[in-house]
Structures are given as C-alpha cells and as structure tokens.
C-alpha cells in the first residue's frame, strides 16, 4: 500500500542566467528512499543512488549541481530550460513516487523565485 505523497516546489520561475533549486520531499511514509531520478520528459538529468551516490548526465554536467539534499540545482539558466521536471523516488517497500515541477525561465529581472524548502 503506497501511503506516501510527494511535495514539490510546484510552479517556479527564475531569471535567465540565474540558478534555481528543484526540490521534492516524500512524506507520509516510512519507506526507505533508495534512489531519486531527476528528469525532463525525455532526458535524464541526474540520479542520486543510496549506494552509488550522484550521477550527473554528461550533457548537463556544466550546469547541474547535486543537492541540496536529494534536490538538484540548475545553473546558468536559459529560456530553453523552461518546462517540466520530474523527481522519481524509488523506495522500499512502497515502490515509485513521482513529483512534477514546472520551471519558467524569464528574460526580465522580475522573475519571482518560488518557495523553496530543504529536505530535513
């Protein structure tokens, strides 16, 4: 029985050239998190594996940084980074939980950064 829920930063915006933290948090379950995938619809950005550590996809190595926690930091943002991002939590014994974040990268300096939180 999967009882957990994923909380995310939801819809967030950031300035072109800036950085943003993508953050998900799994709650309401005692399941053990064994791996977290960070993805776009057809691209793997990074994986954090409990045994193997972090893996950043080579095409994102220059502007993706692991953390904080199980989150992901995107740097040197471009307008092309606008879109959906997914955190995929692999857990034992529950299975897989998924959260979605929509990022809008704005040209102007009035971009409002969405609420952020750290994984305890």
């Amino acid at each position: 029985m999967m009882t957990g829920t994923i909380e995310t930063t939801g819809n967030i915006s950031a300035e072109k050239g800036g950085s943003i933290i993508l953050q998900c948090h799994l709650s309401s379950t005692t399941a053990q998190v064994t791996q977290v995938n960070w993805e776009q619809q057809d691209q793997l950005l990074a994986i954090c594996n409990a045994d193997l550590g972090w893996h950043i996809s080579p095409s994102f190595k220059d502007r993706v940084a692991p953390g904080p926690g199980l989150g992901l930091t995107l740097q040197s943002l471009t307008v092309n980074d606008t879109g959906e991002y997914f955190c995929i939590y692999h857990t034992y014994p529950d299975g897989t939980y998924t959260g979605r974040i929509f990022l809008e990268v704005l040209e102007s300096s009035v971009a409002e950064h969405g609420a952020r939180f750290q994984i305890p």
């Epitope: 993805e39 057809d42 793997l44 594996n49 897989t96």
Partner: antibody
C-alpha cells in the same frame, strides 16, 4: 486499469503511408505520461519509434528521419502513428505503449502486425 | 545512439535452474536499464526498471543488478512459465534502445 489497443490496416503497399491508431481506455492521454510507438520486425528485436506526451509534445527516433509522425485525437482518447514511404523493412508488429517518467514501459497494447507488400 | 548488447543470444536451461543474462551498454548509463519478458505473440512485460527495481506483482525470483555499462538479469529458480525471450533496454537517453534479446529455451 489502463488498456491500450492498436488498430489499422494489416497490409500496406510499398511507398505508401502506414497509419495506425492506439485507443486508450481507463486513463486520459491528456492527464499524464508519454504515449509511445514501438515496433518489432518478425523474429527481431524492439525499436522505439517515438512518443506524444500528455501535453502534445512529440519526440521521434532519428533513425526514422522525417518519415514518422505521431498525433492525437483527445476527443477519442486516441493517438496515431503515420509512417511514410514504407518498404518491406517496415514489416513489423507495431505496439503502442505508455512510458513511465524514467523511460521504461510498464503498459503495452497487444500489438498489430503490419505487412508491407505489393 | 546507445547500443545495448545482450549475451547469450539463446540459452537452454531446466526448471529449477538459476539463469543469468548480461547486457552491456556502449556508454555509461548509470542505473538506467530495464528488463522485459516477451512470450510468442504477446507484448513485452516489464520485469525490472532502474537496473534492480521490480514493479508490483513481479515475482521475487526475477532480479537485476549492475551500473555503468554492465548489467545482469537473473532468474533464481526457473519456472515453466519463464521460458520466453528477454530484452534489456536503456532508459538513459533518447532514442531509447533495446538489446537484441535472449531466447530462453527448455533443455
């Protein structure tokens, strides 16, 4: 429980366009996920052809160049495959499949055999 | 494109045997590999994702391991219904690609 069902002509002439439809029941294709076409020539392995996402974004296998088009009819909860300029090498079982975010395929249709022959 | 090379291409075994199939990726895919079972005239069935995770309902005799470029799929004790063709697939980047398959036959 989501179910996928392929339909379309079982025989297509060389140089013509192959057209298939996948009807999805038990889940709206506009709610989530990416909806894919995967084919398997007789006695051979699997080839991913492309997808249309719940938002309408498409992605294709470059090996099929510009021959493939995937579209959808949200009113019928269907998505479709068109493959142009077919040859005998396009003879295959064509599957529609729902992709999970991680790039794997937990749900498939039963497949439909399309033969390209004159 | 990332090539996935499976071995062996065919394998004969008996009920109760432990069977191992390997898959080698042409580049580092970390843990982004899935395994499928396909029976004649049927669609593939997902058995393993992310190298080692079993979807709900898949028997525990099926397991996967590996990371980087080398991956292993194991059936700990073959059952009569396990005789089929098995495919690996990389889920690291598009175009998603499959191995050529391993046909598991009754000895």
């Amino acid at each position: 429980q989501v179910q996928l069902q392929e339909s379309g002509p079982g025989l297509v002439k060389p140089s013509q366009t192959l057209s298939l439809t996948c009807t999805v029941s038990g889940y709206s294709i506009t709610d989530d996920y990416a909806w894919n076409w995967i084919r398997q020539p007789p006695g051979k392995g699997l080839e991913w052809m492309g997808y249309i996402s719940y938002s309408g974004h498409t992605k294709y296998n470059p090996s099929l160049k510009s021959r493939v088009t995937i579209s959808r009819d949200t009113s019928k909860n269907q998505f479709s495959l068109k493959l142009s300029s077919v040859t005998a090498a396009d003879t295959a079982v064509y599957y529609c499949a729902r992709k999970y975010y991680g790039g794997w395929f937990p749900r498939w249709g039963q497949g439909t055999l399309v033969t390209v022959s004159s | 494109d990332i090539q996935m090379t499976q071995s062996p291409s065919s394998l004969s075994a008996s009920v109760g045997d432990r069977v191992t199939i390997t898959c080698k990726a042409s580049q580092d895919v970390f843990t982004a590999v899935a395994w499928y079972q396909q029976k004649p005239g049927k669609a593939p069935k997902l058995l393993i994702y992310s190298a080692s995770y079993r979807p709900t309902g898949v028997p525990s005799r099926f397991s996967g391991s590996g990371s980087g470029t080398d991956f292993t799929f194991t059936i700990s004790s073959l059952q009569p219904e396990d005789f089929a063709t098995y495919y690996c697939q990389q889920s690291y980047s598009t175009p998603w690609t499959f191995g050529q398959g391993t046909r598991l036959e009754i000895k």
